[in-house]
């Protein structure tokens, strides 16, 4: 097992879950390390603790290893990190990489309010409720940034939108999540659609930084707390 | 499905040495990667050793060159020879498997495992 030493270490190795961070109850998972190419140890740790390792033989590429997970339960939901061995130094810790296990217990609605097709600077908000009591909910623009609104609720959420742009177009689900980590099914996907004339740029989204409280959830965050932009569904972790 | 079967503990003294068996029921052996736990009594389950489907070995510092761990593809078997035993060796060990698994996979954690045996009882007494 890994032992801390701060003097001397190895770069951080990337993390990353293929297919995705958002896993279904039952399904597999692919967690990626990519170290060096000189490592002879790789490490996986899940919540603190040592999960699974894996010695690269000579003959494949050493600079990155695959971990799997056969069947995600809420017990391998959270937050993953690895480290790399090379002679006889470890690497610094990975970003953490947080893994959601979806599809349990329940399915919740989602609605949008005043409708799905709204005109250009309406105002707009989207309704999750979910029949078993939870803690917070969650809504996801499906294909599109990695902002991820929550909001805490007994069995029904709000998430007011403001004015909507060209931007708020697009496909939303919403889960209720059981812990940050365990979440429901997703809802029937909504669809939004905005009709009107050309965009007014004092209708422009709102700064995310002065929303924190809706974007606040992050399964992979930099500095500000914020999502960092890149595909949802095949997400990476670094730097 | 996969089922596990433990057998070989018993009741043995201090110094003494055991080979626990676990027998996989079930085709998808030889892509599994398999574990040895341990419960001592009002204790957690603890991580003893794991053997990748390549043969790759880890172990608890607690029984590090004292227990060995090892495979037979072609009898659906794992093997746990325990020498050097101690009192503190005393618990129910059971077998795991993780399967499917990939390449050369070692897993620590309980979590990873998704079939487990029934147990079987090791007493190490005078």
């Known amino acids: 097992q890994r032992i801390n030493t701060e003097k001397e270490t190895l770069p951080k190795p990337i993390i990353w879950a293929k297919p995705s961070i958002m896993v279904t109850n039952g399904n597999s998972v692919n967690i990626w390390c990519q170290g060096a190419q000189s490592a002879s140890e790789y490490q996986l740790y899940f919540e603190g603790s040592f999960f699974a390792l894996e010695r690269p033989k000579p003959s494949r590429s050493m600079n990155k290893v695959r971990f799997f997970i056969s069947q995600m339960t809420s017990h391998t939901a959270g937050i993953y990190t690895c480290f790399y061995q090379s002679g006889e130094l470890w690497s610094k810790s990975s970003n953490p990489l947080k893994l959601v296990v979806t599809g349990l217990y329940d399915t919740p609605n989602l609605w949008v309010y005043p409708r799905p097709e709204v005109t250009l600077g309406e105002n707009v908000t989207f309704f999750c409720q979910l029949k078993t009591a939870t803690s917070k909910f969650f809504l996801l623009k499906e294909r599109g940034s990695n902002h991820i609104q929550n909001k805490y609720g007994n069995i029904q959420a709000e998430f007011p939108m403001g004015p909507v742009t060209r931007a708020h177009r697009g496909t939303y689900r919403c889960f209720g999540s059981y812990n940050d980590y365990a979440w429901s099914f997703p809802s029937e996907p909504v669809t939004l659609l905005i009709t009107g004339g050309v965009e007014n740029s004092s209708l422009a989204p709102t700064d995310p930084t002065s929303s924190l409280d809706y974007w606040e959830f992050d399964l992979s965050t930099n500095e500000s707390g914020l999502q960092k932009d890149s595909a949802f569904w095949d997400h990476t972790t670094q730097n | 499905e996969v089922q596990l079967v433990e057998s070989g503990g018993g009741e043995v003294q201090p110094g003494g040495s055991l080979r626990l068996s676990c027998a996989a029921s079930?085709?998808?052996?030889?892509?599994?990667?398999m574990g040895w736990f341990r419960q001592a009594p009002g204790k957690e389950r603890e991580f003893v050793a794991a053997?990748?489907?390549?043969?790759?070995?880890y172990y608890a510092e607690s029984v590090k060159g004292r227990f060995t761990i090892s495979r037979d593809n072609a009898k659906n078997t794992v093997y746990l020879q325990m020498s050097s035993l101690r009192a503190e060796d005393t618990a129910v060990y059971y077998c795991?498997?993780?399967?499917?698994?990939?390449?050369?996979?070692?897993?620590?954690?309980?979590?990873?495992?998704?079939?487990w045996g029934q147990g079987t009882l090791v007493t190490v007494k005078p």
């Open positions: 079930g085709r998808t052996f030889a892509s599994a990667a």
């Open positions: 053997i990748s489907r390549s043969d790759d070995t």
């Open positions: 795991a498997a993780v399967v499917p698994t990939y390449g050369n996979n070692i897993y620590v954690h309980s979590a990873a495992y998704n079939y």
